[in-house]
């Protein structure tokens, strides 16, 4: 808490500027009033205040709004953002993704902090869904955000904005979200012809079916290893050695180097001998 | 998942009319097939027609081309057949099934090896 006390005679600040940061914390307190704060927050970021500084508009901006900051303020706040707390934040309401934007590139290149969950979920919760253009937002700032959603949230993202998903933004997905995502993509990308199909939902298989799986199998898709080995177990236990084998294409010489790891592993041991044979890769059931 | 049901069968005279219809719940997308099939008593299973879900494109076995017509509702996610002029030939069990996924039409064609979902199949019998 800053104390209380009357604004030296000639020091009330008529406007943000650089001036200010040779004043002391009770002085800002004093001689900066709040809604000049609020009105030229934009300002503050190209001032070098100090932390203690910066605490003090803090304070000044929870007075002047304590039910939460309109989003006028919000969408300035830059470095002032890094001060607020989580329960700060969930008293906003951000509805327009060019605050959420300038909040992110305030936090950018560090890892997504409370703060920032928080902000996300405010955001998302307010628009209802996840729509594409947020997706593409929160996916360039945090590669790995699609996959920190549980499944119950990623079932709130509309088939459409799975288009704006990079392979990437997949890699840390368990197949509980990829259960999710899978059938989203299947409607997104179901227009779209044989091969470019294909390259678009590869991502995703690690969702599909043994049904899929199999209809795959019968049009040389080629699958690679990678992506073979990130499919459900269930789905490729009941798939045979003549349909494994045409699912993966020339790729097929690559299950003996998995063969000790799921979903190989498994998959091996539910086939004849004689079958596992007819590959020529010496693998044992 | 898709779920396959089909209804419709029944006995009628040569010469006469039935249409087959197949409700398909589940995932139902553009990029499916889905076809009728046949068995007769002692034979095998054998294509009928086939239909390319998302563009309306369609395939007959050369026994009903002309006389067969398969067409689908998108909005009830349902497959109909509808068979004129039937023949004694044409009694058999037949059966809706679907492609979940055709990365081309042509691979739509009704061969049943490539089809991986059933329906348990509906009774259909043509008295001379």
């Known amino acids: 808490e800053v104390e209380k006390t009357a604004c030296p005679s000639g020091k009330k600040a008529r406007e943000i500027d650089e001036s200010l940061i040779f004043y002391k914390k009770w002085e800002l307190e004093a001689c900066v009033d709040a809604a000049l704060l609020a009105t030229q927050m934009d300002r503050v970021n190209a001032i070098p205040f100090t932390y203690e500084q910066l605490d003090v508009l803090k304070h000044k901006l929870d007075e002047l709004y304590p039910q939460g900051y309109p989003e006028s303020v919000i969408q300035h706040l830059g470095y002032l953002f890094l001060k607020m707390s989580p329960e700060d934040i969930r008293k906003w309401n951000v509805t327009s993704l060019e605050t959420l934007k300038a909040l992110l590139e305030v936090n950018k290149g560090h890892e997504m902090s409370p703060q920032v969950a928080t902000l996300i979920d405010r955001f998302v919760k307010g628009r209802g869904q996840l729509d594409k253009d947020t997706l593409d937002t929160l996916t360039a700032f945090y590669p790995g955000y699609l996959c920190s959603l549980s499944p119950e949230e990623l079932s709130s993202v509309p088939p459409s904005s799975i288009w704006a998903v990079r392979p990437q933004d997949l890699d840390t997905c368990d197949p509980r979200q990829l259960d999710v995502l899978y059938p989203k993509a299947r409607l997104a990308f179901q227009n779209m012809n044989g091969s470019e199909y294909f390259v678009k939902i590869q991502s995703f298989l690690g969702g599909a079916p043994t049904e899929d799986l199999k209809a795959l199998s019968q049009q040389n898709v080629s699958m690679d290893l990678a992506t073979f080995m990130k499919l459900r177990t269930d789905a490729v236990l009941p798939l045979t050695v003549a349909e494994v084998q045409k699912l993966l294409g020339p790729h097929v010489e690559g299950l003996k180097a998995e063969e000790r790891h799921r979903p190989v592993r498994d998959w091996i041991l539910r086939q004849r001998q004689d079958d596992l044979d007819t590959l020529g890769l010496g693998l044992q059931g | 998942q898709v779920k396959l049901v089909e209804s419709g069968g029944g006995s009628v005279q040569a010469g006469g009319s039935l249409r087959l219809s197949c409700a398909a719940s589940?995932?139902?997308?553009?990029?499916?097939?889905m076809g009728w099939f046949r068995q007769a008593p002692g034979k095998e299973r054998e294509g009928v027609a086939s239909?390319?879900?998302?563009?309306?494109?369609?395939n007959y076995a050369d026994s009903v081309r002309g006389r067969f017509t398969i067409s689908q509702d998108n909005a009830k996610n349902t497959l109909y057949l509808q068979m004129n002029s039937l023949k004694p030939e044409d009694t058999a069990m037949y059966y809706c099934?679907?492609?979940?996924?055709?990365?081309?039409?042509?691979?739509?064609?009704?061969?049943?090896?490539?089809?991986?979902?059933w329906g348990q199949g509906t009774q259909v019998t043509v008295s001379s």
């Open positions: 589940g995932n139902v997308y553009n990029n499916m097939c």
């Open positions: 239909i390319y879900v998302g563009g309306g494109y369609t």
């Open positions: 099934a679907a492609i979940t996924v055709a990365l081309t039409r042509a691979f739509c064609a009704p061969i049943p090896s490539r089809y991986t979902n």
